[in-house]
């Protein structure tokens, strides 16, 4: 049913879904703090622009009686239940900031007449791609896939002179929500990644992964996995690894690699870590004081969601345009806005663009060093360290198939 929106006459409300099931196990209080900090900034920006309006947020909590797994497995119905609650209360804002779980976002998008914008901190899966009124403020699986294909094909870097066309993917089903959907996208037989590779096998058991490390008959030297260094160590331990194995560890939302006192453990020497470029320090902000570095991106996405709404509200109000229109609902894309931590760019489909950073472990310093950056907005790689002190022979990445000559 069409729900009236509290979104006119100088008063603009944001509906924030506070779901028990979330992409990251973040206390809801921290997300509330992030939203409130965002509101303060938006009010200031609107006031500076001479727009005398009220902007508030309504936090919608689910009862937590039925949907209490805490992760995303039971989120599908929770999102719809919350929407029903909003509908019954006739209490819809101008924008919905909410579901971070792919399941819930997909279902809500499918089952509702969305004439309002939806902003998500998460919704990583391919099933949430190309949704006309959905904006995602954390890197979705599609962006990861495009990086991997770009990197696999690259053969003109001083340290990578072979194109790759094969890979193993380790996916054992215990992954975090972001990793689950990243690996799911790589596994999907119809995905861009699968389409571009000649050989790809998913390893589902620890033993399969461990065996590949020294298997002379392996079909690829490259293994993609997702998680942090500790996750890799639990799996790999101190086992010997063939000299031409390359492990790509996807760990996007973890900026510990950039901290000054961090030393790379020995088991990371055959590993390239893919992460996001670190933001400016958020430690001084009130909302982030209690956050671990890995959770900061999630809370920041909520905060940036508020700032994005403020940005769009300002534009529409300055142009004298109505907020409760399909035009407003479809406007949250193909733009750059001033985020909490600097400019944030959204692509044509409302997905955040970012700079991914590929790190290696220097055999000289035992530090993580930047090998290259990749701009998801233009799908381009920028090599940073042309003479990396790799563990691999001749300080070059090996071919993906042992014994195959130059490509």
């Amino acid at each position: 049913s069409q729900v009236s929106q509290n979104c006119h006459n100088g008063s603009y409300e944001i509906s924030v879904l506070m779901m028990g099931n979330s992409a990251f196990a973040e206390p809801l209080k921290n997300l509330e703090d992030a939203v409130n900090e965002g509101l303060e900034i938006v009010r200031g920006r609107l006031q500076n622009a001479g727009l005398n309006v009220t902007v508030n947020a309504t936090f919608m909590y689910s009862d937590g009686l039925i949907h209490n797994s805490g992760d995303c497995r039971s989120s599908t119905c929770e999102g719809l239940d919350l929407l029903r609650k909003i509908s019954n209360a006739q209490r819809m804002g101008c924008v919905l900031i909410g579901p971070s779980c792919t399941y819930s976002t997909f279902q809500m998008y499918l089952d509702t007449e969305l004439s309002y914008p939806m902003i998500s901190a998460g919704s990583f899966g391919l099933s949430c791609d190309y949704k006309e009124t959905l904006t995602r403020l954390m890197s979705p699986a599609r962006k990861l896939m495009y990086f991997l294909v770009n990197f696999w094909k690259t053969n003109d870097l001083p340290f990578k002179t072979y194109s790759w066309s094969t890979s193993y993917v380790y996916k054992n089903g215990t992954e975090t929500e972001d990793c689950f959907w990243y690996l799911n996208a790589l596994e999907a037989s119809v995905s861009y990644f699968s389409h571009e590779l000649g050989f790809k096998v998913v390893l589902r058991q620890d033993k399969e992964f461990q065996d590949i490390l020294m298997d002379h008959n392996r079909k690829s030297n490259v293994i993609i996995m997702c998680g942090g260094p500790e996750f890799l160590y639990k799996l790999k331990g101190d086992r010997a690894v063939a000299e031409d194995i390359v492990i790509i560890l996807v760990d996007l939302f973890n900026d510990q690699y950039f901290e000054d006192n961090v030393t790379a453990p020995d088991y990371m020497k055959n590993v390239l870590v893919l992460t996001l470029s670190p933001g400016n320090s958020l430690l001084n902000s009130s909302f982030s004081r209690n956050l671990s570095p890995t959770k900061r991106d999630f809370a920041l996405a909520y905060l940036n969601g508020i700032l994005l709404f403020g940005h769009m509200l300002k534009i529409f109000l300055e142009n004298g345009e109505n907020i409760t229109t399909p035009k407003f609902a479809h406007a949250f894309r193909n733009l750059t806005f001033e985020g909490y931590d600097g400019p944030v760019t959204l692509d044509d489909w409302g997905d955040v663009d970012s700079t991914m950073v590929l790190l290696y472990t220097s055999v000289d310093t035992k530090k993580y060093k930047v090998l290259l950056t990749y701009d998801t907005h233009v799908n381009k790689t920028y090599p940073v360290d042309m003479s990396p002190t790799f563990t691999w022979k001749n300080s070059k990445l090996p071919n993906d198939i042992t014994g195959r000559g130059p490509q």
Epitope: P158, V357, D375, V384, M386
Partner: antibody
Framework: EVQLVQPGAEVKKPGSSVKVSCKAS????????ISWVRQAPGQGLEWMGR????????NYAQKFQGRVTITADKSTSTAYMELSSLRSEDTAVYFC???????????WGQGTLVTVSS | QSELTQPASVSGSPGQSITISCTGT?????????VSWYQQHPGKVPKLMIH???HRPSGVSNRFSGSRSGNTASLTISGLQAEDEADYFC??????????FGTGTKVTVL
């Protein structure tokens, strides 16, 4: 399309420092590098150094090591080049330029003429 | 060495082809694909004409082409036109993580 905006001119005394800004408008500094290149009157181009703003990584030409500092402010999409202990031979137009690939500068600022004179 | 060597001047008649050379070492021009060419008209900002040895950015005329042999890169301008009269500089990435520019070549259209 991104443009790099620089101030027009600066006049400095020998021994002093100059800090030239370079602001990206119509886009962000993104993940590319920003290089600084100078050109003395009637002379060729001389590379001074570069920064990858998103990471704060810098490289400087040997000739300017210790005298030049390149920084960037991601939040304002602005890069800066500070040159200290100025002498008359530092009189030049100072350009900032975006490296879309190493040593491949596809977008240039208009240049800032720095005149060092007592 | 912190500069790449170019001829001071090259000239040609309209419609002719000319080639400008840029000589370095195996630590710069010969060692990496990161060799570029720039055109600069008097009082103007340099313009990227070729990058990665032989790649033309969009909007650059296909009369401009780049190549490399050993430690020497070359820029060829075919079908020379009056507007091609300008200074041309090569640049290269170097193993010391720096960039070098060439000494510059003045192209005159006779």
């Amino acid at each position: 399309e991104v443009q790099l905006v620089q101030p027009g001119a600066e006049v400095k005394k020998p021994g002093s420092s100059v800090k030239v800004s370079c602001k990206a408008s119509g886009g962000t500094l993104s993940s590319y590098a920003i290089s600084w290149v100078r050109q003395a009157p009637g002379q060729g181009l001389e590379w001074m150094g570069r920064i990858i703003p998103i990471l704060g990584i810098t490289n400087y030409a040997q000739k300017f090591q210790g005298r030049v500092t390149i920084t960037a402010d991601k939040s304002t999409s602005t890069a800066y080049m500070e040159l200290s202990s100025l002498r008359s031979e530092d009189t030049a137009v100072y350009f900032c330029a975006r490296d879309q690939r190493p040593a491949s500068m596809d977008v240039w600022g208009q240049g800032t003429l720095v005149t060092v004179s007592s | 060495q912190s500069e790449l060597t170019q001829p001071a001047s090259v000239s040609g008649s309209p419609g002719q082809s000319i080639t400008i050379s840029c000589t370095g070492t195996s630590s710069d021009v010969g060692g990496y694909i990161y060799v570029s060419w720039y055109q600069q008209h008097p009082g103007k900002v340099p313009k990227l004409m070729i990058h990665d040895v032989s790649h033309r950015p969009s909007g650059v005329s296909n009369r401009f082409s780049g190549s490399r042999s050993g430690n020497t890169a070359s820029l060829t301008i075919s079908g020379l036109q009056a507007e091609d009269e300008a200074d041309y500089f090569c640049s290269s990435y170097t193993s010391s993580n720096n960039y070098y520019f060439g000494t510059g070549t003045k192209v005159t259209v006779l």
